[in-house]
């Protein structure tokens, strides 16, 4: 059986939309499937790599690599999206391409960045971990670390940094899929909202879905002990 909840929820474009949340009900009247997984149920994607889930994550990453920061022209906010999802009339899509990107590093002006921009994250304004020396962030935003400390400045002069961020990674469903969403939408969908991250590639949704002990390598499920727990 299914339990359907409908509610008006604030979405990425800053408008309220009617959203459906469909929950598979437990046949025996008990915890939901997500709760059962958290409690240690035999759920194979938590035990070993699941090809379907792996393909999903890779597909999400490929899309994210090509994303940019969609900044609303009325200064109402910004969100990481694909160009096609960013209004050409109501917003500005900040995306580095050709020769318009910043240099990879201040010491090497020859190589320009082509992957990015990312709403609220920039190698030129992140103090920790700083993009310098032997630790220059790669030209692939899906390999960027989470910035834990921004440069202490109210404004940077960069459109994608000085905007109010409207969406962050949200881990939704038992499949460990990730979407950049508003907090409201994420909570309504019973997802896990990552306040600290800017990109889906910075979070490991399956690790969150599975719970219990974190995976040794966040990319590789290793909870073999579930076979005995349940």
């Amino acid at each position: 059986a299914q339990h359907v909840t409908t509610q008006l929820v604030l979405r990425n474009k800053g408008v309220y939309e009617s959203v459906k949340y469909i929950q598979q009900e437990n046949f025996w009247i008990g915890p939901s499937s997500i709760d059962l997984i958290h409690l240690g149920a035999k759920f194979s994607p938590c035990i070993r790599k699941d090809q379907q889930i792996e393909q999903l994550v890779l597909r999400e990453r490929d899309l994210e690599r090509d994303s940019g920061c969609c900044v609303q022209n009325d200064h109402s906010g910004c969100i990481q999206t694909q160009r096609k999802d960013c209004s050409e009339t109501l917003a500005t899509f900040v995306k580095w391409q050709d020769d318009t990107g910043p240099p990879m590093d201040k010491s090497d002006l020859g190589q320009k960045r082509t992957s990015g921009a990312v709403c609220h994250q920039d190698p030129r304004t992140c103090e920790e971990p700083a993009s310098s020396g032997a630790h220059i962030w790669p030209d692939d935003i899906t390999k960027w670390p989470i910035c834990t400390e921004q440069a202490k400045s109210n404004r940077t002069g960069f459109l994608h940094m000085d905007c109010q961020i409207k969406g962050r990674p949200c881990c939704i469903s038992t499949k460990g899929s990730c979407e950049i969403t508003t907090r409201e939408y994420c909570e309504f969908m019973h997802g896990y909202f990552h306040e600290e991250a800017t990109l889906c590639s910075q979070v490991h949704c399956l690790d969150k879905v599975c719970g219990l002990l974190p995976f040794l390598n966040p990319e590789v499920p290793d909870q073999f002990y579930r076979l005995w727990l349940s």
Epitope: D99, T100, G101, P102, P103, K106, S107, L109, G110, K112, R124, T125, E127, A130, S132, A151, K152, R155, T156, G157, F158
Partner: antibody, heavy 123, light 106 residues
Framework: QVTLKESGPGILQPSQTLSLTCSFS??????????VGWIRQPSGKGLECLAH???????YSNPALKSRLTISKDTSKNQVFLKIANVDSADTATYFC???????????????WGTGTTVTVSS | QIVLTQSPALMSASPGEKVTMTCSAS?????MYWYQQKPGSSPRLLIY???NLASGVPVRFSGSGSGTSFSLTVSRMEAEDAATYYC?????????FGAGTKLELK
């Protein structure tokens, strides 16, 4: 208010080492993203970038002069120093220091300049 | 190294007149920077990233261009605009300036 002021010997002889100091206020060179650069201008001529130093102690020197240039900083005193070894008459110029910023820029720029100090190399 | 060639080297304009000077790069660059220098003074930043006006710069100044060809325009010349204008690139080391365009008041 951001200000920079250069100081130097005024006159020195060929083969000596030129020592310049840039004293600044209104910002700190420990602030992420900032730098200070040295630029010179022979009388009636154009501008030439010499060297710059960043908040994280990364340095750049013009390759044409690299073997003669040494740039350093004293963050606590808000000062940047430039030494040019083995000077000759071609080093006679006005020497400017300038703050380097990248506010809103994909690259960097010299946003505030000092008034300059004149250096004459003569025997 | 990237050589920046400014033209003309010298030009004069009457008050209210539109003025355009150019800066040509020996190889393609992403952005150009423009500085103004009045006699006996230090340079002052006018334009960054080709077309962005620096803080406090009058809106009569504008920059444009791409690749190897860039220009600085003064929409209506004023007496205080008489100065030497330098273009600069930060696209690759060594950092270079153009030789300057001297703008005089007619």
């Amino acid at each position: 208010q951001v200000t920079l002021k250069e100081s130097g010997p005024g006159i020195l002889q060929p083969s000596q080492t030129l020592s310049l100091t840039c004293s600044f206020s209104g910002f700190s060179l420990s602030t992420f993203g900032l730098g200070v650069g040295w630029i010179r201008q022979p009388s009636g001529k154009g501008l030439e970038c010499l060297a710059h130093i960043w908040w994280d102690d990364d340095k750049y020197s013009n390759p044409a002069l690299k073997s003669r240039l040494t740039i350093s900083k004293d963050t606590s005193k808000n000062q940047v120093f430039l030494k040019i070894a083995n000077v000759d008459s071609a080093d006679t110029a006005t020497y400017f220091c300038a703050r380097i910023l990248n506010y809103g820029s994909n690259y960097w720029y010299f946003d505030v300049w000092g008034t300059g100090t004149t250096v004459t190399v003569s025997s | 190294q990237i050589v920046l060639t400014q033209s003309p080297a010298l030009m004069s304009a009457s008050p209210g007149e539109k003025v355009t000077m150019t800066c040509s790069a020996s190889s393609s660059i992403s952005y150009m920077y423009w500085y103004q220098q009045k006699p006996g003074s230090s340079p002052r930043l006018l334009i960054y990233d080709t077309s962005n006006l620096a803080s406090g710069v009058p809106v009569r100044f504008s920059g444009s261009g791409s690749g190897t060809s860039f220009s600085l325009t003064v929409s209506r010349m004023e007496a205080e605009d008489a100065a030497t204008y330098y273009c600069q690139q930060w696209n690759s080391y060594p950092l270079t300036f153009g030789a300057g365009t001297k703008l005089e008041l007619k």
